[in-house]
Amino acid sequence: LKGQEFAPSHQQVYAPLRADGDKPRAHLTVVRQTPTQHFKNQFPALHWEHELGLAFTKNRMNYTNKFLLIPESGDYFIYSQVTFRGMTSECSEIRQAGRPNKPDSITVVITKVTDSYPEPTQLLMGTKSVCEVGSNWFQPIYLGAMFSLQEGDKLMVNVSDISLVDYTKEDKTFFGAFLL
Amino acid sequence: LKGQEFAPSHQQVYAPLRADGDKPRAHLTVVRQTPTQHFKNQFPALHWEHELGLAFTKNRMNYTNKFLLIPESGDYFIYSQVTFRGMTSECSEIRQAGRPNKPDSITVVITKVTDSYPEPTQLLMGTKSVCEVGSNWFQPIYLGAMFSLQEGDKLMVNVSDISLVDYTKEDKTFFGAFLL
Amino acid sequence: LKGQEFAPSHQQVYAPLRADGDKPRAHLTVVRQTPTQHFKNQFPALHWEHELGLAFTKNRMNYTNKFLLIPESGDYFIYSQVTFRGMTSECSEIRQAGRPNKPDSITVVITKVTDSYPEPTQLLMGTKSVCEVGSNWFQPIYLGAMFSLQEGDKLMVNVSDISLVDYTKEDKTFFGAFLL
């Protein structure tokens, strides 16, 4: 295969080929987040729509309880965009003893959880200081990259402040992964 | 196929396999937009270069009249970056009755048009408030995600203000899609 | 192949099929940059981690001396995120004769070098004016798109100011490519 003429007269073991259409894939879209208690120094995970509108999961890629479950080992492209919105951050206006305040910030992290491993792994992080001088502000953070994942790995999206996430439109805040 | 040893001695129907090299793909790059009248509340669509420089379309993925035409149903990764540029947004400077103005903003939308469906579908949106205090400003908005598309679907990129799009370099503003 | 029943009884040349798992792929992560001399008007290239942590190269995709070396011609998806961080840019505060200063900026370029071609080609550019009024600031620039590359092409990531790159975490600043 791989570019050579195919000659069926000699038995041969080929590298595993598979139809692209049966690879695990998911595109999840934002939903309004339910109020949850979360620890001060821990970024809360978003939960997602997995079947309505533009959202889907297919070929054994399942979504459950804020996690995308990886059904098969391989290299995956993983992406997410989170749109944040808020009222003016006053960080530039109040200066104590002439010293600017620590800026506010917005952060998105795509995290991998492996049951056999005690600590989650941060795969991707987008973090931005927010020091707006206008009134209400809004902006997206986009992330995407390729990672080698194992069957059973779980993926989630964590954010620095769940109350700043724009949940109003499925095209503004989303999360997806597909086996390459 | 799919990981089993290949045994040509028994007739068998296989899942559809296809060479990766013959999948529909396109990468379009920015061109200077022609002067056009557009309606106040409608985001204008960008038109694109499809064959010069870095731009290409291949394997029946065609570009015509601001649209990428999807030649085959399947899951596509779609992406775009639009770099915006402008002179100072005055939103932070003019405050009426101590109240900041509504911020200016820049928005990119990747839109799907299906002839059998009356309304376009917004697949991806990147939107950002712009309230710059320096002189000239510039910044990109990047979008990318996977969607299930049907043969005959058309994709376009719409922006909030066509006059703010940086058309000067093909690596700053672009639009692409490929069948997974 | 391509969806037809497979009939091994007649010799036939098939489109080149190949296992997805043996395609060239790399995900590189940030390391602290070594001090280097670079020319004033030339953006320095970043060097990268290619095997520790989340980083890997596989299937003849090699990393050497700041370059990813393309081992096989084809269409590649190429991506990078660079997180920048700095102290306040004062560009908005010092106005000479009522005129705002030229803004500071941060820029990422993904560049292709082809030995047979004298000039590098800029594939992707993300550039952003930075005119922050708070104290320390930080923000990412993300890029990703598909390009037709030739065997022997080399890819690198250049930045406008290497001292502003956040090298502290492998999930904040990264560079990758994979054959589609």
């Epitope: - | 061109v31 200077r32 022609t34 557009h38 540029r85 402008g86 002179m87 002189s135 066509i162 | -």
Partner: antibody
Framework: QVQLVQSGAEVKKPGASVKVSCKAS????????INWVRQAPGQGLEWMGW????????GYAQKFQGRVTMTADRSTSTAYMELSSLRSEDTAVYYC????????????WGQGTLVTVSS | QSVLTQPPSVSGAPGQRVTISCTSS?????????VHWYQQLPGTAPKLLIE???NRPSGVPDRFSGSKSGTSASLTITGLLPEDEGDYYC??????????FGGGTKLTVLG
């Protein structure tokens, strides 16, 4: 140094066409857009459109749409502006100007070509 | 249709300072690329004086400066010289991507 040298004056009858040339030197012709601007006697400047010499793409002012054609010959680094269906009010000096990509200001100008439309 | 409005004429004695204004009828003019200023001396082609509201191309004396306030741009000439006499035009791009010129201002240097 950058130079834009235009063709000589023309006298045309109403309904005819005129083609003005603008030869560029001192820079890479395909790297900068060329604009055409005209000035009727004793009047102000009026923009007609732009031409990208590399791709041949053009953008015309609405007023001239359908009557103006801008082209480039890359082999000779020459831009052309053709205006058809001439009328007496098209009598003007026609300028080509090279644009600054970043700001779209008109940085270098040709010396101008007087086109007189008279029966 | 957007317009840029300039005063038809201004004048000043040598050594004086004059300011020419350029007011836009629409907020989208100049939003992307600013306002540019050109000088046209009698019988010659226009010459770029100021680009993007403020910036002087090399070779333009620092007697010429540009500024912006709200929807207006201004060109200021200090230390007026007799050779500054001529026409001055502001120019910008509107939201439909068409270039616009102001009507022009005739500068007369007195005496």
């Amino acid at each position: 140094q950058v130079q834009l040298v235009q063709s000589g004056a023309e006298v045309k009858k109403p309904g005819a066409s005129v083609k003005v040339s603008c030869k560029a030197s001192g820079y890479t012709f395909t790297s900068y857009d060329i604009n055409w601007v005209r000035q009727a006697p004793g009047q102000g400047l009026e923009w007609m459109g732009w031409l990208n010499p590399n791709s041949g793409n053009t953008g015309y002012a609405q007023k001239f749409q359908g009557r103006v054609t801008m082209t480039a010959d890359r082999s000779t680094s020459t831009a052309y502006m053709e205006l058809s269906s001439l009328r007496s009010e098209d009598t003007a000096v026609y300028y080509c100007a090279r644009e600054v990509p970043e700001t779209a200001a008109f940085e270098y100008w040709g010396q101008g070509t007087l086109v007189t439309v008279s029966s | 249709q957007s317009v840029l409005t300039q005063p038809p004429s201004v004048s000043g004695a040598p050594g004086q300072r004059v300011t020419i204004s350029c007011t836009s009828s629409s907020s989208d003019i100049g939003a992307a690329l600013g306002v540019h200023w050109y000088q046209q001396l009698p019988g010659t082609a226009p010459k770029l004086l100021i680009e993007g509201y403020y910036n002087r191309p090399s070779g333009v004396p620092d007697r010429f400066s540009g500024s912006k306030s709200g929807t207006s741009a201004s060109l200021t000439i200090t230390g007026l010289l007799p050779e500054d006499e001529g026409d001055y035009y502001c120019q910008s791009w509107d939201g439909t991507l068409s270039a616009l010129f102001g009507g022009g201002t005739k500068l007369t240097v007195l005496g």
